[in-house]
């Protein structure tokens, strides 16, 4: 004999109706549906003193399906989660708890980190980034030609950014000081453009090799307790400009 | 009677982007979550995530939570799943089902996926 | 995760016998006097299909030769007598905790 979903019925009691409403299999005048249809879930409202019998086609927010092979019905999720396949299994936590595995957490565990939009504990995400690219050629004023000391700049993509606890990304562009091949320039040669950004002349004992771009310098420290403020930050502009570093680009 | 009509095989190459769907019918769209389920040739039953049609909101197995994307188009009744950065790995059949009261009871009929070079 | 462990991995058993096929979870998928714990049989080049939910309860339109039992961490589905379309392959399938997981399934063969 199989069994089927909710189609049990009750013994009849002398108040008991087969003309039932909205989904009930059967349903009393005082208690309104005593089960339900197939796939439908019964629950019980409260209407004043009385409680009375419905028949959901899902249950609502908070509450999760069991079934049964007499009836299916409405359970409470845990007190911590809004909305759930089973009181193990939570899909949505109430504010102020992340979601993880199906468990709501006041704080997320050891190597994840909580995504406040999502309200999740989520991996770590850390920086990564791609080979160098080959260098530019050797440049002075935009120009491939001559005697003078010029400059080349490589660059790299970000492959993947990193989250809010993810190490932050090392530098993206690097310049370095270089010899413009040995060639005399043909009258009004322009030589080819330098993938280097044109910058201002250096000012009294600032290094003339590679200039540093020194908001760059934030995106080249690997760990966020390595985050510096930003008086931090102008004391070391000063400090760094009597350097010779590689310029980046920040992300 | 409940339906669920999956789109036709695919064959990718590594790290493109796939997405599958799922049409249902014959029952309230909104009223039961949507879960994914892939089957590797020869292998098990693997879950993959699932989503809400109601209000869309989704989870994911760990396993795929970076590659997978759930979605619906209520008006069309329509799940989809998008999987990327494939791999060949990622080579199976791929299944839609309804999730009522903590269990699969209908399912689609499977998109074969094929991953290769 | 809860790793669902069944034996054996194939079973051969002659019509109109029993087929006996178990499932162990690595931790219980108890919870408030409920199993959740479920079912499938999955013919070749067709989607699984729920045969046992709850651990012990028939779906609709199963013949009643399908019968289910257990609690905790050990569950048994039995096939008695055992007729010639039962052919497939059977999963179990918990549903008490993130992520959902199968078992890697029981291939029946006739003898």
């Known amino acids: 004999q199989n069994a089927s979903r909710g189609r049990r019925q009750r013994r009849m009691h002398p108040n008991v109706s087969q003309g039932c409403q909205g989904g009930c299999a059967t349903c009393s005048d005082y208690n309104g549906c005593l089960s339900c249809k197939p796939r439908l879930f019964f629950a019980l409202e409260r209407i004043g003193m009385k409680q009375i019998g419905v028949c959901l086609s899902s249950c609502p927010s908070g509450y999760y399906g069991t079934r049964y092979p007499d009836i299916n019905k409405c359970t409470k999720c845990k007190a911590d989660c809004d909305t759930c396949f089973n009181k193990n299994f939570c899909t949505k936590c109430k504010s102020g708890f992340y979601l993880h595995l199906g468990k709501c957490l006041d704080n997320c565990p050891e190597g994840l980190e909580a995504n406040n939009h999502t309200m999740e504990c989520v991996s770590i995400v850390h920086c990564e980034v791609s080979e160098w690219n080959p260098w530019s050629p050797c440049t002075k004023k935009g120009k491939t030609c001559g005697f003078k000391r010029g400059t080349e700049t490589r660059v790299r993509e970000i492959i993947q950014h990193p989250s809010a606890k993810g190490n932050l990304c090392p530098p993206t562009n690097e310049t370095r000081k270089c010899t413009v091949q040995r060639k005399k320039c043909q009258k009004g040669e322009r030589g080819k453009k330098g993938r280097e950004r044109k910058r201002k002349k250096p000012n009294k004992g600032e290094s003339k090799e590679a200039i540093p771009d020194s908001k760059s310098l934030e995106s080249s420290k690997e760990i966020p307790e390595q985050r510096e403020n930003k008086q931090q930050q102008k004391k070391r502009k000063v400090q760094d400009k009597q350097k010779s570093v590689s310029v980046s680009t920040v992300h | 009677q409940v339906q669920l009509v999956q789109s036709g095989a695919e064959v990718k190459k590594p790290g493109a982007s796939v997405k599958v769907s799922c049409k249902a019918s014959?029952?309230?769209?909104?009223?039961?979550?949507i879960h994914w389920v892939r089957q590797a040739p020869g292998q098990g039953l693997e879950w993959i995530g699932y989503?809400?049609?109601?209000?869309?909101?989704?989870g994911y197995n760990q396993k795929f939570k970076n590659r997978v994307t759930m979605t619906v188009d209520t008006s069309y009744s329509t799940a989809y799943m998008e999987l990327s950065r494939l791999r060949s790995e990622d080579t199976a059949v791929y299944y839609c089902?309804?999730?009522?009261?903590?269990?699969?009871?209908?399912w689609g009929q499977g998109t074969t996926l094929t991953v290769s070079s | 995760d809860i790793v669902l462990t069944q034996s054996p991995a194939s079973l051969a058993v002659s019509l109109g016998q029993r087929a006996t096929i178990t499932c162990k979870a690595s931790?219980?998928?108890?919870?408030?006097?409920?199993?959740?714990m479920n079912w499938y049989q999955q013919k070749p080049g067709q989607p699984p299909k729920l045969l046992i939910y709850?651990?012990?309860n028939l779906e609709s339109g199963i013949p009643a030769r399908f019968s289910g039992s257990g609690s905790g961490t050990d569950f048994t589905l039995t096939i008695n007598p055992v007729e010639a379309e039962d052919v497939a392959t059977y999963y179990c399938?918990?549903?008490?905790?993130?992520?959902?997981?199968f078992g890697a399934g029981t291939k029946l063969e006739l003898k």
């Open positions: 089902a309804t999730y009522f009261a903590n269990n699969f009871d209908y």
């Open positions: 014959g029952y309230t769209f909104t009223d039961y979550s």
């Open positions: 989503i809400y049609p109601s209000n869309g909101d989704s």
């Open positions: 931790q219980s998928v108890d919870y408030d006097g409920d199993s959740y």
């Open positions: 709850a651990a012990s």
């Open positions: 399938q918990q549903s008490n905790e993130d992520p959902l997981t």
